[in-house]
């Protein structure tokens, strides 16, 4: 006869490990007992349990409540045992010794591998700002046994580098993703993907990129000269910019205070019925936490009685 077993038994932390040991013999052969032991390179052989055909299962007190026979129905030639709630310390080599009649003794060894699934964490890097050079966008760390694989899934262009840290019973892997920040990356996902044999599917953690920027400012509203004539209503100047964080807008007049009746509403400057008093240089000041920009325009309100005058538009940042 011979023993049927496995070279390696793999189990996830906290699950039950079935240590297989089945005697495949002639029909008239019997298994008297099966002795299970842990084989430790330092401590030698340590008895785990004894499975007797007549007296049943006897478990070493060190493994009390942790070693059981598989649930019925049981084959009398099956010496397999269950190791409940596997922990990392259980990892190692195990031996079953089978005493049979009349064929004698057989033994087999197997390795128990306990997988420790990782719990990944993603840490965003420092605040990203347009104009920076290569900058850490995020780092992702996962610790497990064996070492997990940490990769990045993103459409954003960058470079990644990984390093691992070996501990007595596990390994931690840290992967960093660096990029050159640009406004086009705003809102783009950067996903850390962790793979491990103890996971049924990859673990994914997504970080949404935020890149601070402030666009150049410009002023719209002077395109139609006919709107800027004495008596006209509804004339407005609109300041155009964009940024992250969203910018705040402030309007001033270069050559004095804003005329009475001129109303500021965010990015828009609204005028009452126009008079020549509204002529002047108006400045839009755009700012966010990153930067500030200015754009100025010269408004000249035309008097229809004086057709020689033209609207002048000067924009400077």
């Amino acid at each position: 006869g011979e023993l049927e077993t496995s070279d390696v038994v793999t189990v996830v932390l906290g699950q039950d490990a079935k240590l297989p040991c089945f005697y495949r013999g002639d029909p008239d052969e019997q298994v008297g007992q099966v002795a299970w032991a842990r084989v430790d390179p330092n401590e030698g052989i340590r008895e785990l349990a004894l499975l007797h055909s007549k007296y049943g299962l006897h478990v070493n007190p060190a493994y009390e409540d942790r070693v059981e026979q598989p649930p019925p129905p049981r084959d009398p030639l099956d010496g397999s045992v269950l190791l409940r709630n596997a922990v990392q310390a259980d990892e190692g080599e195990y031996e079953c010794r089978v005493s049979t009649f009349p064929a004698g003794s057989f033994q087999a060894r197997m390795r128990l591998r306990v997988l420790v699934p990782p719990l990944p964490s993603l840490n965003p890097g420092p605040p990203l700002e347009e104009g920076q050079g290569l900058t850490l966008a995020a780092s992702c760390t996962a610790e497990g046994s064996p070492a997990p694989s940490v990769t990045w899934d993103t459409e954003v262009k960058g470079t990644q580098s990984s390093r691992s840290f070996t501990h007595p019973r596990s390994a931690a892997v840290t992967s960093e993703f660096h990029l050159v920040p640009s406004r086009s990356m705003n809102g783009q996902p950067l996903t850390c993907v962790v793979s491990h044999p103890g996971l049924l599917q990859d673990r994914r953690i997504t970080h949404t990129l935020q890149v601070a920027f402030l666009a150049e400012a410009s002023v719209r509203g002077l395109e139609d000269q006919n709107l800027w004539q004495v008596g006209r209503e509804g004339a407005t100047l609109k300041c155009l910019s964009e940024g992250q964080p969203p910018p705040k807008y402030n309007w001033t007049r270069l050559d004095g205070p804003l005329p009475s009746g001129v109303r500021v509403k965010g990015d828009t400057l609204g005028f009452p019925p126009l008079t020549t008093e509204h002529s002047g240089v108006y400045v839009c000041h755009v700012s966010n936490e990153l930067s500030s920009r200015d754009s100025q325009v010269t408004v000249e309100v035309l008097d229809p009685e004086d057709p020689g005058k033209q609207v002048d538009l000067v924009s400077a940042s």
């Epitope: 290569l134 850490l136 694989s149 940490v150 990769t151 990045w152 899934d153 993103t154 459409e155 954003v156 262009k157 960058g158 470079t159 990644q160 580098s161 990984s162 390093r163 691992s164 840290f165 070996t166 892997v173 840290t174 992967s175 960093e176 660096h178 050159v180």
Partner: antibody, heavy 119, light 108 residues
Amino acid sequence: QVTLKESGTGILQPSQALSLTCSISGFSLNTTGICVSWIRQPLGQGLEWLADICWDDGKGYNPSLKNRLSISKDTSNNQAFLKITRVDTTDTATYYCARNYGGNPFDYWGQGVMVTVSS
Amino acid sequence: TYELIQPPSTSVTLGNTVSLTCVGDDLPRRYAYWYQQKPDQSIVRVIYEDSKRPSGISDRFSGSSSGTTATLTIRDAQAEDEADYYCHSTYSDDKVRVFGGGTKLTVL
């Protein structure tokens, strides 16, 4: 001025262990974001990355050679080391160390050291 | 295993422009780096992050990347540009740093 200089056993026999040293000046192995890599180039062939070691003692190895490689560092002397066990003739190559900084790979290289494995 | 593919050799007439290519599936999402190797000299990085040129590198060298191809362009090629050129990129796999096989540039 950043410089890296490799040194180590020039000639050794198959099955021996190869030990290499990278002596660094112009930057510190303690600086956050600094890593040192080992790269090799067999005669007439291309470059092959072997291993990294970083400021925080994190390490990276080429999976195809991992079980034979060991990388370490001595921050007090600003040196990085590479050990390759059980060498054979295919390990004959010029070995380089190079700096990585802040995610930017291999911005400075050493001159390289020639290693010959011969019986 | 991930590969960066470079033509083994190319040549250029003195004063002309030559483009060296590097093809890899991950290059749309990963920066390319270019290194110059001359006999008995240290390896020098000539382009980083696809298109940036380190200080001290001639402005005759430029880099670009489009899709799965990164390109190193040398204009007004000089005799001193004769060298082996290697591209490099990090692979999406966490464990590998990859070099192309290298292109030997001959200046005629």
